[in-house]
């Protein structure tokens, strides 16, 4: 049966759902499927049940809201429906389906390198997403950095941040880094999409002046 | 019991400064919204700012934007609301209430609306 | 901002009278409209929320409706202790905005 597989927010004032809509074996057509949403805002289960505002701009087999229909006061339940009947449904609040755009404009400096010339540290600075209203504390959000070499598979992760720039340490020299960072709201699970890839280049000794002017 | 009790409250020039405190008790603080709502002398309420302790999130009225700020102390149940540059105009009982955080609504049989009000605070801002 | 727009600024009423207090949004708000209380010196006090559920301890003769983005708060039968002010407010936006009041004073 069709299921709800996501409910997103990207920055608190606007959120889509979607939904699987798989090929059905051995079952019967269960004709189109339909979302219908209520704001349960007061205790009972009395109030209307209304269908998507908007079918189309969050793509194909979902239903976006926008700032018109979107409350962060206001729990939501959401049910999808086929021939009549419900085959889903879920109930939440926007703060909890934030997943915030990723960061944008990653770039890195070079903090020192290693007297033996081997290692070097760098800072990789980025900023939040556009549509995330961090000045007026309206999105507050918690980074996390993954970086690898580029031949390897297994991504090293470093301890989530509050801040927009964190320092990687003891890269190695003549190695070439993939870099990427992704944001969630703090104390909310749901991490967004990584930005795209930061690659590091770092390289050899030789192309450095004395070590002494990093020291 | 669920109470909300404000203090800081009192008399301070134009330009000047000043924290108001509101202590929670009787409800879990991390689940709420902590709301500031101010009233000048015979006039009406205004909403001026609230923050949601657990995510972090705050938002302020235009009238306060850049010199009011807002904070909590989860392990204190208390809310604060910095007043910075403060005009005549800011002369008001100033409020703080409890909305609940939809997020809980399945734990807490969720309503919406400021349901817990303090006792007030006077700030007279005057020279 | 959302507007709420409350009328009439005061009314004169006597006891066991109907009273009606009225709110309009300048934009949709939903449901998200609540009602408050406040007597002279005190905090104001949660009567309705989400237009029309009456929030728990309040006497069944206050009661909220809804139209589109007009609101009303009707008390059935005014009482001694009702004659007070009262407040509508809008929770939809983030940034929450009440009416102007509307004082119920001893025709």
């Known amino acids: 049966e069709p299921k709800f597989t996501k409910c997103r927010s990207p920055e608190r004032e606007t959120f889509s759902c979607h939904w699987t809509d798989e090929v059905h074996h051995g079952t019967k057509n269960l004709g189109p499927i339909q979302l219908f949403y209520t704001r349960r805002n007061t205790q009972e289960w009395t109030q209307e049940w209304k269908e998507c505002p908007d079918y189309v701009s969050a793509g194909e087999n979902s239903c976006y809201f926008n700032s018109s229909f979107t409350s962060i006061w206001i729990p939501y339940c959401i049910k999808l429906t086929s021939n009549g009947g419900t085959v889903d449904e879920k109930c939440f609040s926007v703060d909890e389906i934030v997943q915030p755009d990723p960061p944008i404009a990653l770039n890195w400096t070079l903090l020192n390198v290693s007297l033996t010339g081997i290692h070097a540290d760098i800072q990789v600075r980025w900023e939040a997403p556009r549509n995330a209203d961090i000045q007026k504390g309206w999105m507050v959000l918690e980074y996390e950095l993954q970086y690898k070499e580029v031949n390897e598979t297994k991504w090293k992760m470093m301890d989530p941040i509050l801040t927009t720039s964190v320092p990687v340490y003891s890269l190695k020299v003549d190695k070439e880094y993939e870099v990427r960072v992704r944001s969630k709201q703090r104390n909310s699970g749901n991490y967004g999409e990584f930005s795209e890839v930061l690659y590091v280049t770092l390289p050899q000794m030789s192309q450095f002046t004395c070590e002494e002017d990093f020291y | 019991e669920v109470q909300l009790v404000e203090s800081g409250g009192g008399l301070v020039q134009p330009g000047g400064s000043l924290r108001l405190s509101c202590a929670a008790s009787g409800f879990n603080f991390s689940y709420s919204s902590i709301h500031w709502v101010r009233q000048a002398p015979g006039k009406g309420l205004e909403w001026v700012a609230y923050i949601s302790s657990y995510y972090g999130y705050t938002s302020y009225a235009d009238s306060v934007k850049g010199r009011f700020t807002i904070s909590a102390d989860t392990s204190k149940n208390t809310a604060y609301l910095q007043m910075n540059s403060l005009r005549a105009e800011d002369t008001a009982v100033y409020y703080c209430a409890r909305l609940q955080h939809p997020s809980w609504y399945y734990y807490q049989g969720y309503h919406s609306g400021m349901d817990y009000w303090g006792q007030g605070t006077l700030v007279t801002v005057s020279s | 901002d959302i507007q709420m727009t409350q009328s009439p600024s005061s009314l004169s009423a006597s006891v066991g009278d109907r009273v009606t207090i009225t709110c309009r949004a300048s934009?949709?708000?939903?449901?998200?409209v609540a009602w408050y209380q406040q007597k002279p010196g005190k905090a104001p006090k949660l009567l309705i929320y989400?237009?029309?559920s009456l929030y728990s301890g309040v006497p069944s003769r206050f009661s909220g409706s809804r139209s589109g983005t007009d609101f009303t708060l009707t008390i059935s039968s005014l009482q001694p202790e009702d004659f007070a002010t009262y407040y509508c407010?809008?929770?939809?936006?983030?940034?929450?905005?009440f009416g102007q009041g509307t004082k119920v004073e001893i025709k």
């Open positions: 934009q949709s708000v939903s449901s998200a």
């Open positions: 407010q809008q929770y939809w936006s983030s940034l929450i905005t």
């Open positions: 989400s237009a029309s």
